[in-house]
């Protein structure tokens, strides 16, 4: 697993470097999670042919994965810092149940899956400190999440492999959009 942000050898070698700003820390955290997702996607694509499957659209309709839309204010046109930040935090909170689902889906990258999950929790904390309008952020209902987890695990092997692939792909896209938006804040 990659070394978490702030613990790499460069930081040790440069003790006089300025401490990271809040925005730099968030940026670095997202890039770290994206590296982890790449490693997990590699295992998924090697293990099955999901990455070339034409049945993605069918399966994707059955997963209510967070997605950036124009109204969320995260795109260059119609950019709105506060609305966008709320969307990023809400989306990450919604992704948590899917990251929990991923925990038992990997053989050789088990630690990597755990690292992505824990780093996302840390990222949410960073972003919550940055957000002023925390009242607008809705936390997913634990009972609903438990039900969703069971439903995902009730699928057959092929559907679970497809679900894993779609979660990783959607989470990567969501984080990339978030990274671009946060760099404008």
């Amino acid at each position: 697993a990659p070394v978490p942000p702030g613990e790499d050898s460069k930081d040790v070698a440069a003790p006089h470097r300025q401490p990271l700003t809040s925005s730099e820390r968030i940026d670095k955290q997202i890039r770290y999670i994206l590296d982890g997702i790449s490693a997990l996607r590699k295992e998924t694509c090697n293990k099955s042919n999901m990455c070339e499957s034409s049945k993605e659209a069918l399966a994707e309709n059955n997963l209510n994965l967070p997605k950036m839309a124009e109204k969320d204010g995260c795109f260059q046109s119609g950019f709105n810092e506060e609305t966008c930040l709320v969307k990023i935090i809400t989306g990450l909170l919604e992704f948590e149940v899917y990251l929990e689902y991923l925990q038992n889906r990997f053989e050789s990258s088990e630690e990597q899956a755990r690292a992505v999950q824990m780093s996302t929790k840390v990222l949410i904390q960073f972003l919550q400190k940055k957000a002023k309008n925390l009242d607008a952020i809705t936390t997913p209902d634990p009972t609903t999440n438990a039900s969703l987890l069971t439903k995902l695990q009730a699928q057959n092997q092929w559907l679970q492999d497809m679900t894993t692939h779609l979660i990783l792909r959607s989470f990567k896209e969501f984080l990339q959009s978030s990274l671009r938006a946060l760099r404008q804040m």
Partner: antibody, heavy 115, light 110 residues
């Protein structure tokens, strides 16, 4: 090779609690939900309940209070709280939820409830 | 309670013929496609045929075809073989992780 096997079926008298066990191999119970299904002699399939990889349970309306599903790392148990003659059936364990799951089944274990 | 109603039962056709089995849900199945079909022969556990309403399970011949969404589903078996004689069940998943089977349809091959 992925497989499931039921055990524990036997002749019991009405009211005597009975626990059936489903032993899995070749896959992890933390990744898959598991269902219990029964079939009375000459009748159709009847879904009893399901337990998720994280231990959450859901039951058919008619089965609530009559059955309890629990699990360990390699087994899933079905406890028949207070069997009646109507519970005489072959009990199957299946991986996942019937429909989009239910891809691997055991051979079943026969429970006979009689006085 | 969630109910799946299968019709007709029994159904019979000659070798090489076609049979169609219908399955109607009392409410929409989860994601409109959480529905599968199983084949069961006497003394055996059910065999997985179709999932997601229309996707063939591994090793199932293309003579078996599933269709439908929401509340109405169909299993069609074409080019009937003697070995297709069995009871067929539809099974659906509903909101809140509740599952159900249809009553079963016996297929007789003449």
């Amino acid at each position: 090779c992925q497989s499931v096997e039921e055990s524990g079926g036997r002749l019991v008298t009405p009211g005597t609690p009975l626990t059936l066990t489903c032993t899995v191999s070749g896959f992890s119970l933390s990744s898959y939900a598991m269902s219990w299904v029964r079939q009375a002699p000459g009748k159709g399939l009847e879904w009893i309940g399901i337990i998720g990889g994280f231990g959450t349970t859901y039951y058919a309306t008619w089965a609530k209070g009559r059955f309890t599903i629990s699990k360990t790392s390699t087994t899933v148990d079905l406890r028949i709280t207070s069997p009646t003659t109507e519970d005489t059936a072959t009990y199957f364990c299946a991986r996942g939820g019937p429909g989009n799951g239910g891809d691997i089944w055991g051979q079943g274990t026969l429970v006979t409830v009689s006085s | 309670a969630q109910v799946l109603t299968q019709t007709p039962s029994p159904v019979s056709a000659a070798v090489g013929g076609t049979v169609t089995i219908n399955c109607q849900a009392s409410q929409s199945v989860d994601d409109n496609n959480w529905l599968g079909w199983y084949q069961q022969k006497r003394g055996q556990p059910p065999k997985y045929l179709i999932y997601s309403a229309s996707t063939l399970a591994s090793g199932v011949p293309s003579r078996f075809k599933g269709s439908g969404s929401g509340t109405q589903f169909t299993l069609t078996i074409s080019d009937l073989e003697c070995d297709d004689a069995a009871t067929y069940y539809c099974a659906g998943g509903f909101s809140g992780n509740i599952f159900a089977f249809g009553g079963g349809t016996e297929v007789v091959v003449k």
